[in-house]
């Protein structure tokens, strides 16, 4: 609450996160023309990335384009991309939606469709839907430990969200354990009124707000965090503005002296930890 | 404008960026002693990195040191690094400019020059100029979509820069479309009074400032962002303070059971999105 | 000092860091049953990661699990994980401490111990202590150049910590050179009253605070940074809250068409650069 006689100062904050959990992923794997069910295990090194600062990312879904090589090939026949003659294809043209640079030739993509030939990583990425349900949907049961160190330099006061008295096997609960800083990802979504299973398909951004309202006067000292959660991406966003949260990254390798890559389109939840508040002192 | 009767609160912000574009790169490639022109395509997975938060990076230029292996070799003969006898080389010495640890021997680098032998990733990186013009100079035509969600917790008010009425095929223009949040990289530089082609060679840091001056009183409500752009690195910086923006990263691989790496010195533009402003309410 | 007649404005900041240094690492390497001493050189591309924003990370220690492959194997026999019969192992169970999903079988881990079989990256990571002394303990002698550009948009004032008059071969010293922005990592720790050699083993988080107290009135203009240092992680933290600073990442590769990875548990220092302060003008 506002104490007008106090000198207020904004918080200086540092955050450290640690995600725990394992996911079992079952997907169709095609090898030598034969498709069979493949089971694999994803641990933290597989589904999260070494990130600094106030964000962490958990991959919940993906689409792989394996064995791409730099060459010429027909582009993917998405809506409006098909052609019937070379006239439709413009040498040197880069369609922002496309994945390559047109050569000017119209070539067969498959038995029934023709598209403009491109210089690109081939075969070009298929623009297929993200798998539903999400491949790492069990990430709902992962947990994240959040460590937050705060400082009010003007008041020369430092504290942190984890106290020596805390129990490392706790799980945050708004009522029963509101000071525990280990959060189940599914609970964060539930608190924010969101459905993890649904968001995991396309990805999204979730805010974890840590609010410090600190009274630093010795006679009524209080300085503990309050956690709240809200979704930061727009779930009603128009297709053209790229709904959800995803990014592409590549694993490069050489095969018979040819540079190749596996392209991964990773969908997931980016968690932004937003720390704010003030320290007041007479 | 300042309304002294209002309670002002700083903005809490979350940013999500999405870069689009393809670059065609032409460079000299040497294979088995023969040098020929190589053409390659770079897409987002090749020139940008999965980054969180308020920054994104676009690689505009690079220098590669391929097939490095850990062994002994002569260091690169940069200014002041040449030697004529072992006396000039100090066993165990690590010159901050060098890339290895001296063995104490002075050995031939080429027909005319001798340098101190080092234990390092060999052959050591040649300290050659960044290619001019920049290899990915066409990145000027890439676009970035910036999504910004803001929150004034004290006023319990949330909004975002992208409204449902917006058109996903717009491009930001200071006069004609100042609310569009899709920016052409070249336009950002032009607005900041900078030359993209020039900065692309050595790299640099560009600030995209998003200013929210929000009046949250119902009778005169206004809360939309204002975008401005300014260069953040010092273009007049002394050589010793590392002008431009670059970093080195490595791709590791095994060949005949020997650990090797390709070292990439990546030059590029780091874009920092700086969100600030206040929300005022009676 | 507070000038009550001034209009104060918080600082908008952008940071760019550049780490320099080489480490020689000596460790035991086992190949074909023979253990010998291996020497290797780590340069910036090996021990740091391309990071944006107000953080940089320097790896000071590591534990490698080489050649892991997805299969079935006994889990690591940490405290409380051993079994004597299949009854102790629950098919489908994922222990948060474990690295895989139990199959329901109790199998020999070694001659004396049995553990639950898991589907995991095998062999599972041994939960061994971080090497002591730290493998890259010589990182104490690395240096970091910090470039900080600040802006007070309301006062339309911009400046940076590096001035044209500065000398690029300086090293920060609290008394002799308090404006130099090249810092020796060991000095940062000494200033913060911490022991680099000790922290390097388990890792930690170190804050570099840059305080700008700017008087922008023309008649008494002053706007230079003041640097201070403090440790941000809790060195007295309970084991259950994961003391120090580490993360796991993987290098993936294919061998005989089998997907493999080397898992690296990287310990190190994350440096958070915390910029704060105000600009005041009549």
């Amino acid at each position: 609450s506002d104490k007008l006689y106090q000198r207020k100062e904004p918080v200086i904050s540092s955050v450290h996160t640690k995600v725990k959990g394992i996911a079992e992923v079952t997907e169709n794997v095609t090898e030598g023309g034969v498709t069979k069910l493949g089971h694999s295990i994803f641990d933290t090194a597989d589904y999260t990335f070494p990130l600094q600062g106030n964000s962490f990312f958990v991959m919940t879904n993906y689409v792989k384009s394996e064995g791409q090589v730099q060459t010429l090939c027909p582009e993917y026949p998405r809506r409006g991309a098909q052609c019937s003659s070379d006239r439709r294809c413009k040498k040197g043209w880069m369609d922002p939606q496309s994945k390559g640079i047109q050569t000017g030739r119209c070539v067969p993509y498959d038995k029934t469709r023709k598209t403009c030939e491109v210089s690109a990583w081939c075969p070009t990425e298929e623009e297929k839907e993200a798998p539903r349900p999400a491949l790492l949907r069990s990430a709902e049961n992962f947990t994240v430990l959040i460590k937050n160190n705060i400082h009010f330099p003007g008041h020369n006061y430092t504290t942190r969200n984890i106290l020596p008295t805390m129990n490392g096997s706790c799980t945050f609960h708004k009522t029963w354990d509101p000071q525990c800083s280990i959060f189940r990802l599914g609970d964060i979504f539930q608190e924010a009124g969101e459905n993890f299973t649904e968001v995991a398909v396309q990805g999204g951004i979730m805010g974890i707000e840590i609010y410090w309202d600190c009274n630093l006067d010795s006679w009524s000292h209080h300085c503990r965090p309050r956690y709240s959660f809200r979704r930061l991406d727009d779930k009603n966003m128009d297709e053209s503005f790229v709904p959800g949260y995803n990014f592409r990254y590549a694993k490069y390798y050489k095969e018979n002296n040819v540079e190749k890559r596996t392209l991964i389109k990773a969908f997931g939840i980016r968690f932004d930890i937003l720390v704010f508040g003030t320290g007041g002192k007479f | 404008s300042d309304k002294l009767y209002q309670r002002k609160e700083p903005v809490i912000s979350s940013v999500h960026t999405k870069v689009k574009g393809i670059a065609e790169v032409t460079e000299n490639v040497t294979e088995g002693g023969v040098t020929k022109l190589g053409h390659s395509i770079f897409d987002t997975a090749d020139y940008t990195f999965p980054l969180q938060g308020n920054s994104f990076f676009v690689m505009t230029n690079y220098v590669k040191s391929e097939g490095q292996v850990q062994t002994l070799c002569p260091e690169y003969p940069r200014r002041g690094a040449q030697c004529s006898s072992d006396r000039r080389c100090k066993k165990g010495w690590m010159d901050p400019q060098s890339k290895g640890i001296q063995t104490g021997r002075c050995v031939p680098y080429d027909k005319t020059r001798k340098t101190c032998e080092v234990s390092a990733w060999c052959p050591t990186e040649e300290e050659k100029e960044a290619p001019r013009p920049a290899l990915l100079r066409s990145a000027e035509n890439f676009t970035v979509l910036i999504k910004n969600n803001i929150h004034f917790p004290g006023h319990n008010y949330t909004t975002r820069n992208i409204l449902p009425t917006m058109n996903g095929s717009c491009t930001f223009h200071k006069t004609w479309d100042p609310q569009c949040s899709i920016f052409r990289l070249g336009d950002i530089f032009q607005e900041a009074g900078e030359n993209f082609t020039e900065v692309a060679v050595q790299g640099g840091i560009m600030g995209i400032e998003i200013y929210w001056d929000c009046n949250l009183d119902s009778w005169s409500h206004h809360c939309r962002p204002r975008y401005s752009f300014r260069r953040l690195d010092d273009k007049n910086m002394d050589e010793s303070f590392v002008p431009g923006y670059n970093f080195r990263y490595a791709k590791y691989y095994k060949e005949n059971n020997v650990e090797k790496r390709t070292l990439i010195k990546a030059f590029g533009i780091r874009f920092d999105i700086l969100v600030f402003g206040t929300g005022g309410k009676f | 000092s507070d000038k009550l007649y001034q209009r104060k404005e918080p600082v908008i900041s952008s940071v760019h860091t550049k780490v320099k240094g080489i480490a020689e690492v000596t460790e035991n390497v086992t190949e074909g049953g023979v253990t010998k001493l291996g020497h290797s050189i780590f340069d910036t591309a090996d021990y740091t990661f391309p990071l944006q924003g107000n953080s940089f990370f320097v790896m000071t220690n590591y534990v490698k699990s080489e050649g892991q492959v997805q299969t079935l194997c006994p889990e690591y026999p940490r405290r409380g994980a051993q079994c004597s019969s299949d009854r102790r192992c629950k098919k489908g169970w994922m222990d948060p401490q474990s690295k895989g999903i139990q199959t329901g079988r109790c199998v020999p881990y070694d001659k004396t111990r049995k553990t639950c079989e898991v589907s995991a990256w095998c062999p599972t990571e041994e939960e061994k202590e971080a090497p002591r002394p730290a493998l890259l303990r010589s990182a104490e002698n690395f240096t970091v150049l910090i470039k900080n550009n600040i802006h007070f948009p309301g006062h339309n004032y911009t400046t940076r910590n590096i001035l044209p008059t500065m000398n690029g071969s300086c090293t920060f010293h609290k008394t002799w050179d308090p404006q130099c922005s090249i810092f020796r990592l060991g000095d940062i720790f000494q200033e913060a009253g911490e022991n680099f050699t000790e922290v390097a083993v388990q890792g930690g988080i170190m804050g570099i605070e840059i305080y700008w107290d700017c008087n922008l009135d023309s008649w008494s203009h002053h706007c230079r940074p003041r640097y201070s240092f403090r440790r941000l992680d809790d060195k007295n933290m309970d084991e259950s809250f994961v003391p120090g600073y580490n993360f796991r990442y993987a290098k993936y590769y294919k061998e005989n068409n089998v997907e493999k990875r080397t898992l690296i548990k990287a310990f190190g220092i994350r440096f958070d650069i915390l910029v704060f302060g105000t600009g005041g003008k009549f």
Partner: nanobody
């Protein structure tokens, strides 16, 4: 020093079976993974099958999967290879070896990870 002695080879018709044995002496091999390799005339030595130290996990080359079974008896310091439904392309000298490491799960098929090969036993499959 470890000695490995293979036995059980011979001439057999296509479709027939053989059981190879490998007796170890000089050191207990129960702490080590063990494997079978083979070398056909004019070809490189190739991995056939391997078993980890405890006998719980086994690995095979694709061409013998389902036909060959590797097993061990640690009490007798002996390794076995049961070969069924033999084919002409299985003709080779078969060697046993023990795994020196590191990391059996990843390197079970790499000849350089094994040491102390035996003298070998000839298997000939006539069609």
């Amino acid at each position: 020093e470890v000695q490995l002695v293979e036995s059980g080879g011979g001439l057999v018709q296509a479709g027939g079976s053989l059981r190879l044995s490998c007796a170890a002496s000089g050191r207990t091999v129960s702490d080590y993974g063990m494997g079978w390799f083979r070398q056909a005339p004019g070809k490189l030595r190739e991995f056939v099958a391997s078993i980890n130290w405890s006998g719980i996990y086994t690995r095979y080359i694709d061409s013998v999967e389902g036909r060959f079974t590797i097993s061990r008896d640690n009490t007798k310091n002996t390794l076995y290879l049961q070969m069924n439904n033999l084919k002409a392309e299985d003709t080779a000298v078969y060697y046993c070896a023990y795994f020196l490491g590191p990391n059996w799960y990843s390197n079970y098929g790499r000849p350089s990870s094994y040491g102390f090969y035996g003298q070998g036993t000839q298997v000939t499959v006539s069609s």
